[in-house]
């Protein structure tokens, strides 16, 4: 296919940075100030993308390549290359449609993005919790309860030093 | 205004050699392929040898090992030395510009107006 399209397409070996110039007879030229092509054999050149109110430069914008943006502190990106910023939060909030709201009781948002998230069920994997959550932590699961049964202790002592011969008491 | 004027053709001797010049202006230089083409009397025009902007080359069969094309960006200038020079070598050489930088199958975008070489004893 590539050396079909190389003998039919007379533009195939321009290359990136170029467009294949039909107002001058199919010979190459450089993109224009603020465009660029990334691939060869382009017949014309993208006009670079411009990071402006909320957004900012990330990477300036170069004959071929398109300029980055990335947000301004206060925001973070989401979308497919940093199509949109969206205001952060504090950790312990979610984002609404009317703006940052506290976790409620029993969730919790480690993150300045996203939301807020249940805190772990302990007890379904029979453990019981050893440090309770927050709006910023989840919990956190300790033993099971039967492992801290009365004499019993989470913290398994080292062996006594036993003479040869000796078997367990 | 793309203009491409070849120099440097002249008479010579059998075995003698030969360097042809062409001048280049109006476009981006070294981003564009060129190439040189001849013209014998009563013959067709034909290739004789390409240059991609990369500097890879390539020449017609009749002329490989002894036709050295090659070009200086700076200048915007490309060259065809000449060597080995035969009677069948006798033509008018022009310098072309390549379309879309192509050098497999290059079909030509501008011509220049074609320097005379004339090898004969």
């Known amino acids: 296919f590539e050396r079909t399209r190389s003998l039919q397409d007379p533009c195939s070996n321009c290359p990136a940075g170029t467009f294949c110039d039909n107002n001058r007879n199919q010979i190459c030229s450089p993109c224009p100030p603020n465009s660029f092509s990334s691939a060869g054999g382009q017949r014309t050149c993208d006009i670079c993308r411009q990071c402006k109110g909320v957004f900012r430069t990330r990477k300036e914008c170069s004959s071929t390549s398109n300029a980055e943006c990335d947000c301004t502190p206060g925001f973070h990106c989401l979308g497919a290359g940093c199509s949109m910023c969206e205001q952060d939060c504090k950790q312990g909030q979610e984002l609404t449609k009317k703006g940052c709201k506290d976790c409620c009781f029993g969730t919790f948002n480690d993150q300045k993005r996203g939301i807020c998230r249940p805190w772990t069920n302990c007890s379904l994997d029979g453990k019981s919790v050893l440090v309770n959550g927050t709006k910023e932590r989840d919990v956190v699961c300790g033993p099971s309860p039967a492992d801290l049964s009365p004499g019993a202790s989470s913290v398994t002592p080292p062996a006594p030093a036993r003479e040869p011969g000796h078997s367990p008491q | 205004e793309v203009q491409l004027l070849e120099s440097g053709g002249g008479e010579v001797q059998p075995g003698g050699s030969l360097r042809l010049s062409c001048a280049a202006s109006?476009?981006?230089?070294?981003?564009?392929?060129m190439g040189w083409y001849r013209q014998a009397p009563g013959k067709r025009r034909e290739f004789v040898a390409a240059?991609?902007?990369?500097?890879?080359?390539v020449y017609a069969e009749s002329v490989k090992g002894r036709f050295t094309i090659s070009r200086d960006n700076a200048k915007n200038t490309v060259y065809l030395q000449m060597s080995s020079l035969r009677a069948e070598d006798t033509a008018v050489y022009y310098c072309?510009?390549?379309?879309?930088?192509?050098?497999?199958?290059?079909?030509?975008?501008?011509w220049g107006q074609g320097t005379l070489v004339t090898v004969k004893p």
């Open positions: 072309g510009l390549l379309k879309g930088n192509r050098v497999v199958s290059p079909s030509v975008a501008y």
């Open positions: 109006g476009f981006s230089f070294s981003i564009n392929a």
């Open positions: 240059i991609y902007s990369g500097r890879n080359t």
